[in-house]
Interface confidence: low
């Protein structure tokens, strides 16, 4: 006889990185027919939601309306089936953003490199802090960490085409507190160096900044459940 | 076109210091890295360390570490090395050189060097 | 730190013979290798990066090969204004380090 219900996923709407007194949802999907989802905040009961009518739905939503550093922290949900509770879903690890400064991020040799160089990311920011982010936006949304005094150095190593990408950084004064994003840079790769000249003397950084770094439901990011799962656990390990 | 003018030839007495300046021209300072160098009478070149001028970040050779201060100014485009407690095994030409386009780690523009000689 | 070892450490050729220099270095180093030319009294000057690319301006008598740990230079046709020492450079791994360098003389 089953004694635990499949894990839910949990996920954060529109992102798991949060600019403070901005609003986030946190979404917990289990299955039809639960009559009871509990939010647990660092460990601790956090909300309760009892959908109805519950054998037409099979998420919930838990709203933050003014997001600041004491919501920030790690979070977990279950759901139950009649006396039947789930096992907990994968932590969420929401991140509150823009707090405090802006870091600055550039790329060495340049933002346009060809296939083998060596590219090393460096993410600067002057008030105390010791860890930094830098992520690649798309849908891996992926995460490296780095360590530093008032600088981190991210080295990418000999690059291919598939670090193409928009890079941006953060300065953490916590696990669940960074800066304001940096502004972006645009990583170009072009072909295999055997086949490329030599380029124009002076590389020049992408003019085109994105008006948010907030990632919205066009990526397709927040569909895919899962991928989120895998993405705010491994975030922060 | 890309230049470096090193500033010109010292004699030093053993235990002062000498700043050397390597000013760049001819492109953007900021998006390259200027590399020290050294290379002693009849000897191969030995790298000292490298500084990228749009950060501020210096990497040494641990040899050096106590012995060269690498620096840049932005403003005058102009790369500084400082080497104290000079010795005479310090009697050498100092080159700067231009970090490639590419993160392929070649030196593709150099200064003309400047020679240091340290004598009592 | 990788140890790059050059040979021979001169060598002396007639005006359009071809000439080989090789360099070893003491741990893979991929394809981060690159060569100078020294002419004395003066900078170095970058020939080729990345094992085989020839830095522009670089007449294409000159020319490099070699992955890992063994590499190749080689003049295919010496000019009397190649007259100089050259040395190798390995880029793979900080401290950026040098071969000893190999004299080239006309006979």
């Known amino acids: 006889q089953q004694q635990t219900l499949p894990k839910p996923f949990i996920w954060a709407e529109p992102h798991f990185m949060v600019p403070k007194e901005k609003q986030v949802t946190i979404c917990c999907q289990g299955n039809y027919g639960a009559v009871e989802y509990q939010l647990h905040f660092e460990g601790s009961l956090f909300a309760v939601d009892r959908p109805k009518p519950p054998e037409r739905i099979n998420k919930v939503k838990f709203y933050i309306p003014d997001m600041n550093s004491r919501m920030a922290g790690q979070y977990s949900c279950i759901y139950r089936v009649g006396e039947l509770w789930s096992e907990p879903s994968n932590l969420l690890d929401l991140v509150v953003t823009e707090m405090y400064d802006t870091p600055t991020l550039s790329v060495h040799p340049g933002p346009e490199v060809i296939s083998g160089e060596k590219v090393t990311f460096y993410c600067r920011l002057d008030t105390a802090t010791s860890m930094f982010l830098l992520l690649k936006e798309g849908r891996s949304s992926h995460v490296q960490r780095g360590y530093g005094k008032v600088q981190a150095e991210f080295p990418l190593g000999p690059v291919t085409t598939a670090h193409r990408g928009t890079y941006r950084c953060f300065g953490s004064y916590n696990n669940h507190a960074w800066s304001f994003p940096s502004e972006p840079v645009k990583l170009l790769v072009t072909g295999d160096i055997e086949n490329t000249s030599l380029a124009p003397e002076d590389p020049t950084f992408p003019a085109d900044t994105w008006g948010t770094y907030l990632l919205t439901t066009e990526t397709g990011l927040q569909k895919d459940h899962a991928l989120w799962d895998h993405t705010a656990q491994n975030l922060l390990r | 076109q890309v230049q470096l003018v090193q500033s010109g030839a010292e004699v030093k007495k053993p235990g002062s210091s000498v700043k050397v300046s390597c000013k760049a021209s001819?492109?953007?300072?900021?998006?390259?890295?200027i590399n020290w160098g050294r290379q002693a009478p009849g000897q191969g070149l030995e790298w000292i360390g490298e500084?990228?001028?749009?950060?501020?970040?210096?990497y040494y050779n641990e040899k050096f570490k106590a012995k060269a201060t690498i620096t840049a100014d932005k403003s005058t485009s102009t790369a500084y090395m400082e080497l104290s407690s000079l010795r005479s095994e310090d009697t050498a030409v100092y080159f700067c050189a231009r970090r490639g386009r590419y993160g392929l780690y070649a030196m593709d523009y150099w200064g003309q060097g400047t020679t240091v000689t340290v004598s009592s | 730190d990788i140890q790059m070892t050059q040979s021979p450490s001169s060598l002396s050729a007639s005006v359009g013979d071809r000439v080989t220099i090789t360099c070893r270095a003491s741990q893979d180093i991929s394809n981060y290798l690159n060569w100078y030319q020294q002419k004395p009294g003066k900078a170095p000057k970058l020939l080729i990066y990345?094992?085989?690319r020839l830095h522009s301006g670089v007449p294409s008598r000159f020319s490099g090969s070699g992955s890992g740990t063994d590499f190749t230079f080689t003049i295919s046709s010496l000019q009397p204004e190649d007259i100089a020492t050259y040395f190798c450079?390995?880029?793979?791994?900080?401290?950026?380090?040098f071969g000893g360098g190999t004299k080239v003389e006309i006979k």
């Open positions: 001819g492109y953007t300072f900021t998006d390259y890295v």
């Open positions: 990345y094992t085989s």
């Open positions: 500084i990228y001028p749009g950060s501020g970040t210096n």
């Open positions: 450079q390995q880029g793979n791994t900080r401290p950026w380090t």
